[in-house]
């Protein structure tokens, strides 16, 4: 059974992940971002189901495509360069989903834009955090 300290750690990690994803979304939606139209042409895979921490496997697999899209954006929109930002997110995701997970990601048939993708995972983080508090 999860202890209060492990629950608190999970909550903090999810909050960190949430902030990173929100920062990316804000950077992309910045009205000064001239690359937004181009960025919206990239397609992302969405999870069929995202209700548990193990489902973060689906986010992990899309981090490299996310980095490639962020490389198009103006670097001043983000505090970190895309490679470092994604690496930080990857570390959190690996810890949250657990290295021993046997879950294989299943994706929805429809792909999504980067904005829809980020919003989906932001909602996921918010949902899990609300169950922990």
């Amino acid at each position: 059974a999860p202890t209060s300290s492990s629950t608190k750690k999970t909550q903090l990690q999810l909050e960190h992940l949430l902030l990173d994803l929100q920062m990316i979304l804000n950077g992309i939606n910045n009205y000064k971002n001239p690359k937004l139209t181009r960025m919206l042409t990239f397609k992302f895979y969405m999870p069929k189901k995202a209700t548990e921490l193990k489902h973060l496997q689906c986010l992990e697999e899309e981090l490299k495509p996310l980095e490639e899209v962020l490389n198009l954006a103006q670097s001043k929109n983000f505090h970190l360069r895309p490679r470092d930002l994604i690496s930080n997110i990857n570390v959190i995701v690996l810890e949250l989903k657990g290295s021993e997970t046997t879950f294989m990601c299943e994706y929805a048939d429809e792909t999504a834009t980067i904005v829809e993708f980020l919003n989906r995972w932001i909602t996921f983080c918010q949902s899990i955090i609300s169950t922990l508090t």
Epitope: Y45, C58, E61, K64, R83, M104, Y107
Partner: antibody, heavy 119, light 107 residues
């Protein structure tokens, strides 16, 4: 024990095709990105291709793009490399390797399988 | 593409020597640098990842340092089993690229 075992190498004529396989054991195959790395005789290492854990994302070196196809069958714990329109410069030992995450370090390697393209 | 240049391409050393191999990237790759050891007829083996992290099971005589464009692999006291070829590899961006290798031979 974590293990990768390649097979399918051999002699093929220029323009021919070959399919390499890599059988994985000792770890949860579907949660790891997997790659192929090659080494021409007496030369250094060259990254060829990477595939995500579920198989939906694939990445290729420019030198093989359009000719090689990476795929995986997670139910069989097997990674594949379909090589078409082979050229003499594709002659190499092909290694399959596990990545800690996509574009992470290659932490587990197979023993390699030799592909020779010659007429 | 990011070019990785190793030096020297080969070196001769004795058991017990301190050996240093350098790797230079053509652009800033932060600490996304890995080192591998390869013996003749064998697959490469991961020694160091993220520039300075020692891979599990690798002897502590191996160490890595550096960030940005300049990196170093050090073997503090060369052992008989360390005679091999060493490769650096960047995992900063695609295509993933390796150095040309440094062959460590017995003096």
């Amino acid at each position: 024990e974590v293990q990768l075992l390649e097979s399918g190498g051999g002699l093929v004529q220029p323009g021919g095709s070959l399919r390499l396989s890599c059988a994985a054991s000792g770890f949860t195959f579907s949660t790891y990105a997997m790659s192929w790395v090659r080494q021409a005789p007496g030369k250094g290492l060259e990254w060829v291709s990477t595939i995500s854990g579920s198989g939906v994302r694939t990445y290729y070196a420019d030198s093989v793009k359009g000719r090689f196809t990476i795929s995986r069958d997670n139910s069989k714990n097997t990674l594949y490399l379909q090589m078409n329109s082979l050229r003499a410069e594709d002659t190499a030992v092909y290694y399959c390797a596990r990545e800690t995450y996509i574009y992470g370090p290659f932490d587990v390697w197979g023993q390699g399988t030799l592909v020779t393209v010659s007429s | 593409d990011i070019q990785m240049t190793q030096s020297p391409s080969s070196l001769s050393a004795s058991v017990g020597d301190r050996v240093t191999i350098t790797c230079r990237a053509s652009q800033d790759i932060s600490t996304y640098l890995n080192w591998y050891q390869q013996k003749p007829g064998k697959a490469p083996k991961l020694l160091i990842y993220d520039a300075s992290s020692l891979q599990s099971g690798v002897p502590s005589r191996f160490s890595g340092s550096g960030s940005g464009t300049d990196f170093t692999l050090t073997i503090s006291s060369l052992q008989p089993e360390d005679f091999a070829t060493y490769y650096c590899q960047q995992s900063y961006s695609a295509p993933l690229t390796f150095g040309q290798g440094t062959k460590v031979e017995i003096k």
